[in-house]
């Protein structure tokens, strides 16, 4: 089920806000495993592969881009929410 927040994140991602949303290097998801048939819902990569991708933010995997993005906690910014607002 697509939550309103997922839709919002997708809108933000596609409207390119590079300061608050990040995607890793292409090499990181260059080798894609073939989709297994009948395996059901795929595990969210944010829970494992990109668990520590966002420093001061929450990881959200954007399927359309096949990449994680970060939603920053207050006062933080940058690709991985690593920068502190002055």
């Amino acid at each position: 089920d697509l939550q309103e927040a997922d839709l919002d994140l997708l809108r933000v991602t596609l409207s390119s806000k590079p300061q608050a949303l990040a995607t890793p290097n292409k090499e990181e998801h260059g080798k894609r495993k073939k989709k297994g048939k009948g395996l059901g819902k795929k595990r969210d990569p944010c829970l494992r592969k990109y668990k520590d991708f966002c420093i001061h933010g929450e990881c959200k995997y954007v399927k359309e881009l096949r990449a994680p993005s970060c939603i920053c906690h207050p006062g933080y910014h940058g690709e991985r929410c690593h920068g502190l607002s002055l």
Epitope: A5, K17, Q19, C59, K60, I71, H73, P74, S85
Partner: antibody
């Protein structure tokens, strides 16, 4: 629909500790933050701190650091706030709220629990 | 810490009147990354939990009547109720989320004459 249900009223003696709970439903628990705010009788709102269940990150108001501990149980979608070394000035209604985001940033509280009244008295 | 100061502390107006209340922050709340002001407004009716009205200084939360509007930038912000209704009796709080610790204004109490 989104709901935050808080535990019932508590009466504690000075020096004791209390653990309040906030059970979330109707949304993906790990996607949002849970913040804690208190309101003393007849007073305004005071931010205590917040936890992001997805990452486990916690942030505290310096005033409550060392006395407040925020935790979250993702398996039950429940957030907790423990407050120790209670004093009479801690008498207040304690609210939990969902911290939402837009435009790539968190920061505002779009759903609130009903509040838990904590009374600290000898 | 960022200090939020609201004015006036209280005001009384008649039903149908336009009302404005102010919130001033001790430093700019403008995020340079998205050019938006990290300020929210809440309404708290007697005996109830606060309710989100406005975020990003001027974005109305879903379901909030359009008589409520927010404006301002940098350090000075305003909440306007274009035509006050009896059910608007409440305390209104502003809150900054520019940086930690998150802070609230002391509130503005709205009463009906």
């Amino acid at each position: 629909q989104v709901q935050l249900v808080q535990s019932g009223a508590e009466v504690k003696k000075p020096g004791a500790s209390v653990k309040l709970s906030c059970k979330a439903s109707g949304y993906t628990f790990r996607t949002y933050g849970i913040t804690w705010v208190r309101q003393a009788p007849g007073q305004g709102l005071e931010w205590i701190g917040e936890i992001f269940p997805g990452s486990g990150n916690t942030y505290y108001n310096e005033k409550f650091k060392g006395r407040a501990t925020l935790t979250a149980d993702k398996s039950t979608s429940t957030a907790y706030m423990e407050l120790s070394s209670l004093r009479s000035e801690d008498t207040a209604v304690y609210f939990c709220a969902r911290e939402s985001f837009s435009d790539g940033y968190y920061g505002y509280f779009d759903y609130w629990g009903q509040g838990t009244l904590l009374t600290v008295s000898s | 810490d960022i200090v939020m100061t609201q004015s006036p502390d209280s005001l009384a107006v008649s039903v149908g009147e336009r009302v404005t209340m102010n919130c001033k922050s001790s430093q700019s709340l403008l995020y340079s990354t998205n050019q938006k002001n990290s300020l929210a407004w809440y309404q708290q009716k007697p005996g109830q939990s606060p309710k989100l009205l406005i975020y990003w200084a001027s974005t109305r939360e879903s379901g909030v009547p359009d008589r409520f509007s927010g404006s301002g930038s940098g350090t000075d912000f305003t909440l306007t109720i274009s035509s006050v209704q009896a059910e608007d009796v409440a305390v209104y709080y502003c809150q900054q989320y520019y940086r930690y610790p998150l802070t609230f204004g002391q509130g503005t109490k709205l009463e009906i004459k």
